[in-house]
Interface confidence: low
C-alpha cells in the first residue's frame, strides 16, 4: 500500500533500524498525531500486513474533545531475532479513504554463525568409508566450514578444506569429530561427535566339520583398527524351515544358541546340538571398542547319526512251527529319520541269520520242522540312514503255553517275508 | 572497534634478527582469526609471510619457511614476528593484519613499520 | 604457489567517469564450494591496504557501491563506476584459495 500525496503524512516517528544477532530481542517504534479518532495502526514487514503483529498502541488525547488531536503510538516487540524477521518494517494507518505508511525501518540479522546441522554420534567399522554432515548459515554469509578430527584441522583454513559433507575414507582408531563454522563475525564450534571403530564383520563362515550332535565352524576375522579382538560371538538357531531368516530378518524367531570363541584361532566347535537338524549360525566379533555386525546367517545342518538305543520291550514266542517277535521303538534319539529295524536270530550251534523288517515292528516267522532247536535267541536293532544302532540283548524265543497271553501283534504275518529254513534243523 | 598496533626498530644490521610486535585490542586473539604478518617491498610488491592462528598453530610461507617464526602472548593480546638472517633483501615495510576465518581475507591492517636493513 | 598478474600498472581517470582493472590468476581460483577466492585492496597514499572486495564480488563493509568485482575463475574485473578523488592509490588483487597467499603487483589509480 502506498499514501496518497494529498495529505500530509500523519506520521511524526518512524520505525528504527535493528542489527542484531539470533535470540536478540527489539522494538520497533512508530508515532503519528491525527485528528479525531485513533486509527488502527498496523505493521507491515517487506510490504505485507503482519496479522499476528506482538503489538501495543497507546494513544494519547491532546485536547478535551474527542475531535482534537491524539498522539498515537504502536510498538512492535520482536522476540528472539531469527531470520525469518528480517525485512523492511513500516506502520500503516487508513484515515478516511486515504491510506499512510511511515518511513521503513529494517530489522537484519547479523551475528555468529548458527548450526543447522551437526555431526552425530555413530559407530563404523574399521577402515570403512563413512560421510559426516555438518551446516551452519549467517548473515552474515558467506559461512565457511573447518572440520577437526581428533582436535586438528583437516585443511589448513576454514572452507579450503571439506564443507557440509565430510568424506572419511577410514579410521583405525576411535576418534571425535567437530566442525567449526567461520564468518566475518568469527567462529562458532559444533558438538564433538564421537567415532567409534567396530570390527569389519568377519568374513568367510564355513563349516569345517559336522557330526551329529555338533558342528565345527571356522571364519576369517575383519580389521579391528589398533584394537585387538578380544573374543568372538558365534549364535546357532533352529531353522524351523528357516522361516524369517531367508526372509532376511535380522533377527532371529527364538533365543539362539550362544558359544564365546577365544581368538585366535577363529574356530569353534559348537556341541548340544540336534542330529539331522537344520541350524543357521552367525558369528560377531568383539574388540575393546565393542561388536561388529553379525555376518548373515549361514543354513547349516547337523548329519543324521545311529539310534542310540536299541528297540524296547522286544518279545518272543514260539508256537509250533511259528515264532511272533516284535518291539518297540528305541526311547533313546534315533539322531535321524528311522528307516527301519533289522532281526537276528541264531540257535545253539548255529550260525546267525539277518534279517531286514522294514518300519513294521513285529514279525511271524515260519519254522519248518517241529521248531526243536535249542536255545532260540532274538536280537533287533533300529537304524538310518547313518547305520545301526546298538543291538537289543539277545531274547530267548521261549515256547507259548495255553491261556498265556499272546502279544497284541504276533498274529499278523508278514507274507511277503517267505518262510526260513533251516537246512541243518 | 579492533585496532593493531605496530612496534619494533625501524633499523636491523645484516645476519641479525628482526623482531616486530602487532598489539591487539578490541578482539581477543585466541577468540578467533588468522592473525598475519605481510610485507611491502621499496617496489610496493607485498608477500604474505605468515599467521598464527587463534588456536595456536602457525602456517608459514615456504620462502622464508627456515627464518620465521610467528609467536603470541594472549595475556597481553600480543602476536610477534622475528626473521632471522636478514639481508638487505628484507628492507620492507612490515604490517601486521587480522585475516578473516574466510580464508584469512585481511579486514584490519597495523599503520606499518618500515624496516631497513643495513650496516 | 598460484601468479597473480594485473593490468595495466597505472591508470588514470576522470573525476566522474568509470574505470576498470584487470587480474589473471595462474590458476582457477573457483573453489567446490561454489567460492571464488580473489580479493581487491586499495592502499591510499601513505596508509595500510584495506579491504574492498572478497571473494571475487562480495563488498567488504563500508565500501560504496560504486566498486563491483566480477570475472570467471582466472580472469577478474574490479569496476570503480564513477572515480572520485578518494579513489587514488594502488590497488592490489590477491588470491586466498591456497596458502601462501599471493599478490598482484599492483594498479596505479591517478585522476587527469
Known amino acids: 500500500p502506498r499514501g496518497t500525496q494529498a495529505e500530509e503524512s500523519p506520521f511524526v516517528g518512524n520505525p528504527g533500524n535493528i542489527t542484531g544477532a539470533r535470540g536478540l530481542t527489539g522494538t520497533l517504534r512508530c508515532q503519528l498525531q491525527v485528528q479525531g479518532e485513533p486509527p488502527e495502526v498496523h505493521w507491515l514487514r517487506d510490504g505485507q500486513i503482519l496479522e499476528l503483529a506482538d503489538s501495543t498502541q497507546t494513544q494519547v488525547p491532546l485536547g478535551e474533545d474527542e475531535q482534537d488531536d491524539w498522539i498515537v503510538v504502536s510498538q512492535l516487540r520482536i522476540t528472539s531475532l531469527q531470520l525469518s524477521d528480517t525485512g523492511q518494517y513500516q506502520c500503516l494507518v487508513f484515515l478516511g479513504h486515504q491510506t499512510f505508511v511511515s518511513q521503513p525501518g529494517y530489522v537484519g540479522l547479523e551475528g555468529l554463525p548458527y548450526f543447522l546441522e551437526e555431526p552425530e554420534d555413530r559407530t563404523v567399522a574399521a577402515n570403512t568409508p563413512f560421510n559426516l554432515s555438518c551446516q551452519a548459515q549467517g548473515p552474515p554469509e558467506p559461512v565457511d566450514l573447518l572440520w577437526l578430527q581428533d582436535a586438528v584441522p583437516l585443511a589448513t583454513a576454514p572452507g579450503h578444506g571439506p564443507q557440509r559433507s565430510l568424506h572419511v575414507p577410514g579410521l583405525n582408531k576411535t576418534s571425535s569429530f567437530s566442525c567449526e563454522a567461520h564468518n566475518a563475525k568469527g567462529v562458532t564450534t559444533s558438538r564433538t561427535a564421537t567415532i567409534t571403530v567396530l570390527p569389519q564383520q568377519p568374513r568367510n563362515l564355513h563349516l569345517v566339520s559336522r557330526q551329529p550332535t555338533e558342528l565345527e565352524v571356522a571364519w576369517t576375522p575383519g580389521l579391528s583398527g589398533i584394537y585387538p579382538l578380544t573374543h568372538c560371538t558365534l549364535q546357532a538357531v533352529l531353522s524351523d524351515d528357516g522361516m524369517g531368516i531367508q526372509a532376511g530378518e535380522p533377527d532371529p524367531p527364538e533365543e539362539p544358541l550362544t558359544s564365546q570363541a577365544s581368538v585366535p584361532p577363529h574356530q569353534l566347535r559348537l556341541g548340544s546340538l540336534h542330529p539331522h537338524t537344520p541350524y543357521h549360525i552367525r558369528v560377531a566379533c568383539t574388540s575393546s571398542q565393542g561388536p561388529s555386525s553379525w555376518t548373515h546367517w549361514l543354513p547349516v545342518e547337523t548329519p543324521e547319526g545311529v539310534p542310540l538305543g536299541p528297540p524296547e520291550n522286544i518279545s518272543a514266542t514260539r508256537n509250533g512251527s511259528q515264532a511272533f517277535v516284535h518291539w518297540q521303538e528305541p526311547r533313546a534319539p534315533l539322531q535321524g529319520t528311522l528307516l527301519g529295524y533289522r532281526l537276528a536270530y541264531q540257535g545253539q550251534d548255529t550260525p546267525e541269520v539277518l534279517m531286514d523288517i522294514g518300519l513294521r515292528q513285529e514279525v511271524t516267522l515260519e519254522l519248518q520242522g517241529d521248531g526243536s532247536v535249542s536255545n532260540l535267541t532274538v536280537c533287533v536293532a533300529a537304524y538310518t540312514a547313518a547305520g545301526d544302532g546298538p543291538w537289543s540283548l539277545p531274547v530267548p524265543l521261549e515256547a507259548w503255553r495255553p491261556g498265556q497271553a499272546q502279544p497284541v501283534h504276533q498274529l499278523v504275518k508278514e507274507p511277503s517275508t517267505p518262510a526260513f529254513s533251516w537246512p541243518w534243523w | 572497534q579492533v585496532q593493531l598496533v605496530q612496534s619494533g626498530p625501524g633499523l636491523v644490521k645484516p645476519s641479525q634478527s628482526l623482531s616486530l610486535t602487532c598489539s591487539v585490542t578490541?578482539?581477543?586473539?585466541?577468540?578467533?582469526?588468522?592473525w598475519n604478518w605481510i610485507r611491502q617491498f621499496p617496489g610496493q610488491k607485498l608477500e604474505w609471510m605468515g599467521y598464527?592462528?587463534?588456536?595456536?598453530?602457525?602456517n608459514y610461507n615456504p620462502s622464508l619457511k627456515n627464518r620465521i617464526s610467528i609467536t603470541r602472548d594472549t595475556s597481553k593480546n600480543q602476536f610477534f614476528l622475528k626473521l632471522n638472517s636478514v639481508t638487505s633483501e628484507d628492507t620492507a615495510t612490515y604490517y601486521c593484519?587480522?585475516?578473516?576465518?574466510?580464508?584469512?581475507?585481511?579486514?584490519?591492517w597495523g599503520q606499518g613499520t618500515t624496516v631497513t636493513v643495513s650496516s | 604457489d598460484i601468479v597473480m598478474t594485473q593490468s595495466p600498472s597505472s591508470v588514470s581517470v576522470t573525476l566522474g567517469q568509470s574505470a576498470s582493472i584487470s587480474c589473471r590468476s595462474s590458476?582457477?581460483?573457483?573453489?567446490?564450494?561454489?567460492?571464488?577466492?580473489l580479493y581487491w585492496y586499495l592502499q591510499k597514499p601513505g596508509q595500510s591496504p584495506q579491504l574492498l572486495i572478497y571473494?571475487?564480488?562480495n563488498l567488504a563493509s563500508g565500501v560504496p557501491d560504486r566498486f563491483s568485482g566480477s570475472g570467471s575463475g582466472t580472469d577478474f574485473t574490479l569496476k570503480i563506476s564513477r572515480v572520485e578523488a578518494e579513489d587514488v592509490g594502488v590497488y592490489y588483487c590477491?588470491?586466498?584459495?591456497?596458502?601462501?597467499?599471493?599478490f598482484g603487483g599492483g594498479t596505479k589509480l591517478e585522476i587527469k
Open positions: 593484519a587480522r585475516g578473516w576465518l574466510l580464508h584469512y581475507t585481511m579486514d584490519y
Open positions: 578490541g578482539f581477543s586473539i585466541s577468540s578467533g582469526y588468522y
Open positions: 598464527r592462528s587463534y588456536d595456536g598453530s602457525n
Open positions: 590458476r582457477s581460483l573457483l573453489h567446490s564450494n561454489g567460492f571464488t577466492y
Open positions: 571473494q571475487m564480488s
Open positions: 590477491g588470491q586466498n584459495l591456497e596458502l601462501p597467499l599471493t
